[in-house]
């Protein structure tokens, strides 16, 4: 689930079994010149960044929940 910082795809691999409890925020990066795929990068409670699989149903649920809570705040 390493996250790179150069101007290319940041997610080299994604984590399986992510749980929403420790996710502080989620950054969804749309495809662009730097990377041809959607990337989902979560910031965990301890500050660590973790790449999530955007195709995973649970990740979609987490993103939806986060977006909804952002709207209500």
């Amino acid at each position: 689930a390493s996250v790179a910082t150069e101007l290319r795809c940041q997610c080299l691999q994604t984590l399986q079994g992510i749980h929403p409890k420790n996710i502080q925020s989620v950054n969804v990066k749309s495809p662009g010149p730097h990377c041809a795929q959607t990337e989902v990068i979560a910031t965990l409670k301890n500050g660590r960044k973790a790449c999530l699989n955007p195709a995973s149903p649970i990740v979609k649920k987490i993103i939806e929940k986060m977006l909804n809570s952002d709207k209500s705040n």
Epitope: Q16, K21, L44, K45, N46, R48
Partner: antibody, heavy 119, light 107 residues
Amino acid sequence: QVQLQQSGAELVRPGSSVKISCKASGYAFSDYWMNWVKQRPGQGLEWIGQIYPGDADTNYNGKFKGKGTLTADKSSSTAYMQLNSLTSEDSAVYFCARERDYDVAMDYWGQGTSVTVSS
Amino acid sequence: DIQMTQSPSSLSASLGGKVTITCKASQDINKYIAWFQHKPGKGPRLVIHYTSILQPGIPSRFSGVGSGRDYSFSIRNLEPEDIATYYCLQYDNLPWTFGGGTKLEIK
């Protein structure tokens, strides 16, 4: 490597309190939730609660609210659980267990601390 | 709180054989189930998390499946060191709750 070393067995009187410890090594103690689990003799496992040493945030099983108090000392990388107003129902082995940051699975466990409440 | 009903409470199987343990949750737990192996005098050992993901170092003889409320855990090619009590744990919603345990014995 990650290790959780728990304090030794305790024999205590009914009505008294006991504080058991769990010393962590091999990882950033402040960055991971620490869970506590109870096992009575011949019984199954029961989740008591958890503490996040980084900000002292806690979650408790409602059943144990008022019975157990969770604290953590970042300087010594040690988590503590104090059990109050002890009765025979509190005689058990208590385990600490680290919760992994991304998937909350309890991946490392202490060896357990036996608490016997007897007059 | 979510209840986890684990069955059977004990079972006996032959070396080389296969066993299956089931856990039923009182509500959908979104695949957030873990399975632990517990031997006397030791701390429990994480075997599987998120329904089917094997913990590093655990042999592929162990497996898990399930979704919604129904989950199962299997061990094939049973070996003597598999003798233990096995517990499921739901961690979808706090408080985390364990199943009652299954004591595995070898015939």
